[in-house]
C-alpha cells in the first residue's frame, strides 16, 4: 500500500469563453481509496478555491459554471490526490479561458444542388453557427471548414470557408451520393467535432469542370472567384 | 429568493462566547464560498472571516486570529462563527455574506448584532 | 497586509453634479477591486467589480476604472437617492480588506 500516484490534468475546454471544465488522469491509486480535489487560484491572487462542481464533467473533471468563469484571468489550478498514505499533487496548470474554446458544431446544415440556366450547375452549402456562441458580441470570430465525399469514397475533400456560413462547389461527380459536414473554430481555439453528415444526391446530369471549383464569398458582396483546382489545393487544404 | 439570515447576536461580558449562524436560501449553498463581514457601531466595514465551499480552507483577520473558528454545515445550508474570548472591541453588526465565483461579496445577510460590554 | 485607503473620508455635492471617489492600494492589487454602496441603515450592495464592471441594476451614472495601485468611483450626475456612505474592497488576498468610507451627502 503506497500513497496515489501523481495526477495529471490533460485537458480543459470551454464551449463558448462562458463556461469551462479541466479533466485529469488519476496516477496509480497505490491500492487503497484515493480523494480527488482540485484547487485554483487566479493570476494575481493568493485567495485559494475549491472546484466549484465535480459532477458535470463526468468523472476527475472540474466544471466551471458562468459565475466562476473570467475571460481576463489566468487560472492556475492543481489537482491533489490523498489516500491513507499520503497525499500527491499534480503540476500545476495555467488556463487562459480565451485559448480554450472548442465549440459545438455549427448547426443546420443545408445541401442543395443549384442548376442556374444561365450558368453551371453548383452545390450550395448553407449553416449556422452553434448556440452558444454569441457573435453579436464581437468577442468571438469562427472560421469554418467543410469536408465533403462521394459516399463510398475513402478521402475527404476539404474547403476552408473563412468566417462565411455558406459555400459554393462546382466540381463534382455527376450521379454520386455526397456525404457533407462542416466544422468551426474560434480564432485561438480548438476545432469543433464535425457536424452530423448531410446526404445529397448529385444529379447525373450535372456537368463539371475538373480545371476549376467556384467558389463565393459572401464577404465580398457576393462576387464570385475562380479558382484554379491547384490554388485551392494549396490555400485551402488542410 | 436568494437569501442570508443571521441569527445568534446577543449582549455578552468580556471573555464570554457566542456562536451566530446564518442560514441560506434559494441558492445552491455549498457551491459558494462564505465569509463574515462586520460593522461596529458608526464605522466601516470590516472583513472577519472565509471559509471556502467545502469547508477545507479558512481565512481570518489577524485581529480575531486564535479566538474565532468559522465552520459550515452544507446538509444544512448554514454558516457559523464560534466567538470565544469576546472583548468590547468585536461589538459590532455581524454581517453573513456569500463570495461569488470572482471573488465579491454579491448577497449578503440583514445582520446580527453582538455586544460586549460589561 | 495591503492596506486601502479611501479619499475623501466624507463630501458634499449638489444634484447633478459629479463626484469622484478615491481609493489606493498599497501594493499592486491587479484590477481585483470591488466597490460597495451602504445606505443609512441598510445592508452594503455591490456595485462594481474587477475596477470597471457595473452589477445589472446598477445606474450608468456609476463608473469605475483604475488598475494596480489607484481606483476611481465616479457618479456622473449625483442624485438624491445617491446619498450613502462608499466602500472600496480587495478580493485577491486575505485579509479582504475594506477602505474606510466616503460619506457622499447633498448640498
Known amino acids: 500500500q503506497l500513497p496515489p500516484g501523481k495526477p495529471e490534468i490533460f485537458k480543459c475546454r470551454s464551449p463558448n469563453k462562458e463556461t469551462f471544465t479541466c479533466w485529469w488522469r488519476p496516477g496509480t491509486d497505490g491500492g487503497l481509496p484515493t480523494n480527488y480535489s482540485l484547487t485554483y487560484h487566479r493570476e494575481g491572487e493568493t485567495l485559494m478555491h475549491e472546484c466549484p462542481d465535480y459532477i458535470t464533467g463526468g468523472p476527475n473533471s472540474c466544471h466551471f459554471g458562468k459565475q466562476y468563469t473570467s475571460m481576463w484571468r489566468t487560472y492556475i489550478m492543481m489537482v491533489n490526490a490523498t489516500n491513507q498514505m499520503g497525499s500527491s499533487f499534480s503540476d500545476e496548470l495555467y488556463v487562459d479561458v480565451t485559448y480554450i474554446v472548442q465549440p459545438d458544431p455549427p448547426l443546420e446544415l443545408a445541401v442543395e444542388v443549384k442548376q442556374p440556366e444561365d450558368r453551371k450547375p453548383y452545390l450550395w452549402i448553407k449553416w449556422s453557427p452553434p448556440t452558444l456562441i454569441d457573435l453579436k458580441t464581437g468577442w468571438f470570430t469562427l472560421l469554418y471548414e467543410i469536408r465533403l465525399k462521394p459516399e463510398k469514397a475513402a478521402e475527404w475533400e476539404i474547403h476552408f470557408a473563412g468566417q462565411q456560413t455558406e459555400f459554393k462547389i462546382l466540381s463534382l461527380h455527376p450521379g454520386q451520393k455526397y456525404l457533407v459536414q462542416v466544422r468551426c473554430k474560434p480564432d485561438h481555439g480548438y476545432w469543433s467535432a464535425w457536424s452530423p453528415a448531410t446526404f445529397i444526391q448529385i444529379p447525373s446530369d450535372f456537368t463539371m469542370n475538373d480545371e476549376q471549383k467556384l467558389i463565393s464569398e459572401e464577404d465580398l458582396g457576393g462576387e464570385q472567384k475562380l479558382i484554379s483546382e491547384e490554388d485551392l489545393h494549396h490555400h485551402h487544404h488542410h | 429568493e436568494v437569501q442570508l439570515v443571521e441569527s445568534g447576536g446577543d449582549l455578552v461580558q468580556p471573555g464570554e462566547s457566542l456562536r451566530l449562524s446564518c442560514t441560506a436560501s434559494?441558492?445552491?449553498?455549498?457551491?459558494?464560498?462564505m465569509n463574515w463581514v462586520r460593522q461596529a457601531p458608526g464605522k466601516g466595514l470590516e472583513w472577519v472571516s472565509y471559509?471556502?465551499?467545502?469547508?477545507?480552507?479558512?481565512y481570518y483577520v489577524d485581529s480575531v486570529k486564535g479566538r474565532f473558528t468559522i465552520s459550515r454545515d452544507n446538509a444544512k445550508k448554514s454558516l457559523y462563527l464560534q466567538m470565544n474570548s469576546l472583548r468590547a472591541d468585536d461589538t459590532a453588526l455581524y454581517y453573513c455574506?456569500?463570495?461569488?465565483?470572482?471573488?465579491?461579496?454579491?448577497?449578503w445577510g440583514q445582520g446580527t448584532m453582538v455586544t460586549v460590554s460589561s | 497586509d495591503i492596506q486601502m485607503t479611501q479619499s475623501p473620508s466624507s463630501l458634499s455635492a449638489s444634484v447633478g453634479d459629479r463626484v469622484t471617489i478615491t481609493c489606493r492600494a498599497s501594493?499592486?492589487?491587479?484590477?481585483?477591486l470591488a466597490w460597495f454602496q451602504q445606505k443609512p441603515g441598510k445592508v452594503p450592495e455591490l456595485l462594481i467589480s474587477?475596477?470597471?464592471t457595473l452589477q445589472s441594476g446598477v445606474p450608468s451614472r456609476f463608473s469605475g476604472s483604475g488598475s494596480g495601485t489607484y481606483f476611481t468611483l465616479t457618479i456622473s450626475s449625483l442624485q438624491p437617492e445617491d446619498i450613502a456612505t462608499y466602500y472600496c474592497?480587495?478580493?485577491?488576498?486575505?485579509?479582504?480588506?475594506f477602505g474606510g468610507g466616503t460619506k457622499v451627502e447633498i448640498k
Open positions: 474587477a475596477a470597471s
Open positions: 434559494g441558492f445552491t449553498f455549498n457551491s459558494y464560498e
Open positions: 501594493q499592486d492589487i491587479f484590477n481585483y
Open positions: 471559509i471556502s465551499s467545502s469547508g477545507g480552507t479558512k
Open positions: 474592497q480587495r478580493y485577491n488576498s486575505a485579509p479582504l480588506t
Open positions: 455574506a456569500r463570495l461569488n465565483g470572482v471573488d465579491v461579496f454579491d448577497i
